[in-house]
């Protein structure tokens, strides 16, 4: 899987995609889980709704909502009042029956606010920063980086 | 072992710019960010910024923000930290710090050995 | 910015001595709080991180606890290598900041 990166601003929301196949995803709950050190395992931080009818629904733990169209093939997460300690490795998961397939693996930087004591004239987005000479723009708040690009840590 | 070696003492003009290096060993370099901390002259800590080696992404404190630039080349596993538009006031030893947190940030573990960076006319 | 105080300034003790210092935040960060010892003309040396996790290789005669706003260090059985400056930093909020520092010398 390639890895894409979310960057976000602390203290403001931020917005995850996942795409995927609604055909081969078809009838399957989904997962937002957080890589545990380099080799540990990835921790679930919410799931849809039990009721796979009802994954359009939108269900919170904490601060992380999650919110599937299923028709469409887009899982989104929100990370609501970003703090540092949400930087991390995570994985959008298909689940079927005690299994987990990866959907797709992100990379959530907490940028510091550029905005703080700063006029508003230097408006500023994640997506405009010049630091990701190895990646190509997704959208205006990640970039992908292709494996390959860059020697990606192993995961287990 | 986890290892971080920084450049040597360097010595500038105010008004000119710095590139301290940090090259890092024994771990896998992309999967932690590299902090750079200074301190001044009988001063504390200051926290200046990170880098997250394997993305490039970087943030750093309100302070330093459009001086500071920070980069690293993964090929060799180093990173480096260019302080520009130099003062007196930055004199100080420059420290990159390991994070010790899987591409996360779980406040750092290991410590170059410091790079002295004197700026004097 | 989260002001970081530490107290007291500067104490001194005996070796054997039981050493607390105290850090506190000017608002909650939770346990994002780290602990250094630094020796003169030296680089910091992580001890403790999350408020009360021994860095790996550090001795169990340090200790941290705390949340909140409130931390403490404790050096169980001062032993001559400790006398050293010890500061806390808060990893919760940016910009990440420092306390002052606590300087511990010889009695």
């Known amino acids: 899987h390639n890895t894409t990166v979310f960057q976000g601003v602390a203290g403001q929301s931020l917005q995850v995609s996942c795409p995927y196949d609604s055909m081969k995803h078809w009838g399957r709950r989904k997962a937002w889980c957080r890589q545990l050190g380099e080799k540990g395992p990835c921790q679930r931080v919410v799931s849809t709704h039990n009721l796979w009818l009802l994954s359009f629904l939108r269900r919170w733990n904490g601060s992380t909502a999650i919110t599937d169209d299923t028709l469409g093939g887009t899982l989104t997460i929100t990370l609501r009042n970003l703090q540092p300690h949400d930087a991390g490795l995570y994985q959008c998961q298909s689940l079927h029956g005690s299994e987990a397939d990866t959907l797709r693996k992100v990379l959530v930087e907490v940028l510091a606010d550029p905005l703080d004591h700063r006029d508003a004239g230097d408006l500023w987005f994640p997506g405009e920063s010049e630091s990701f000479e190895d990646a190509h723009v997704e959208h205006s708040i990640s970039r992908s980086l292709l494996e390959g690009e860059i020697p990606f840590p192993p995961t287990s | 072992q986890v290892q971080l070696v920084q450049s040597g003492a360097e010595v500038k003009k105010p008004g000119a710019s710095v590139k301290v290096s940090c090259k890092a060993s024994g771990y896998t370099f992309t999967g932690y960010y590299i902090h750079w901390v200074r301190q001044a002259p009988g001063l504390g800590l200051e926290w200046m910024g990170w880098i997250n080696p394997y993305s490039g992404g970087t943030t750093s404190a309100q302070k330093f923000q459009g001086r500071v630039t920070m980069t690293r080349d993964t090929s060799i596993s180093s990173a480096y930290m260019e302080l520009s538009r130099l003062r007196s006031d930055d004199t100080a030893v420059y420290y990159c710090?390991?994070?010790?947190?899987?591409?996360?940030?779980?406040?750092?573990?290991?410590w170059g050995q410091g790079t002295t960076v004197t700026v004097s006319s | 910015d989260i002001q970081m105080t530490q107290s007291p300034s500067s104490l001194s003790a005996s070796v054997g001595d039981r050493v607390t210092i105290t850090c506190r935040a000017s608002?909650?960060?939770?346990?994002?709080l780290a602990w250094f010892q630094q020796k003169p003309g030296k680089a910091p040396k992580s001890l403790i991180y999350a408020a009360s996790s021994l860095q790996s290789g550090v001795p169990s005669k340090f200790s941290g606890s705390g949340s909140g706003t409130d931390f403490t260090l404790t050096i169980s059985s001062l032993q001559p290598e400790d006398f050293a400056t010890y500061y806390c930093?808060?990893?919760?909020?940016?910009?990440?900041?420092f306390g002052p520092g606590t300087k511990v010398d010889i009695k």
């Open positions: 930093q808060q990893y919760s909020t940016y910009p990440f900041t």
């Open positions: 608002q909650g960060i939770s346990n994002y």
């Open positions: 710090a390991r994070d010790g947190g899987y591409l996360a940030l779980y406040g750092t573990d290991v």
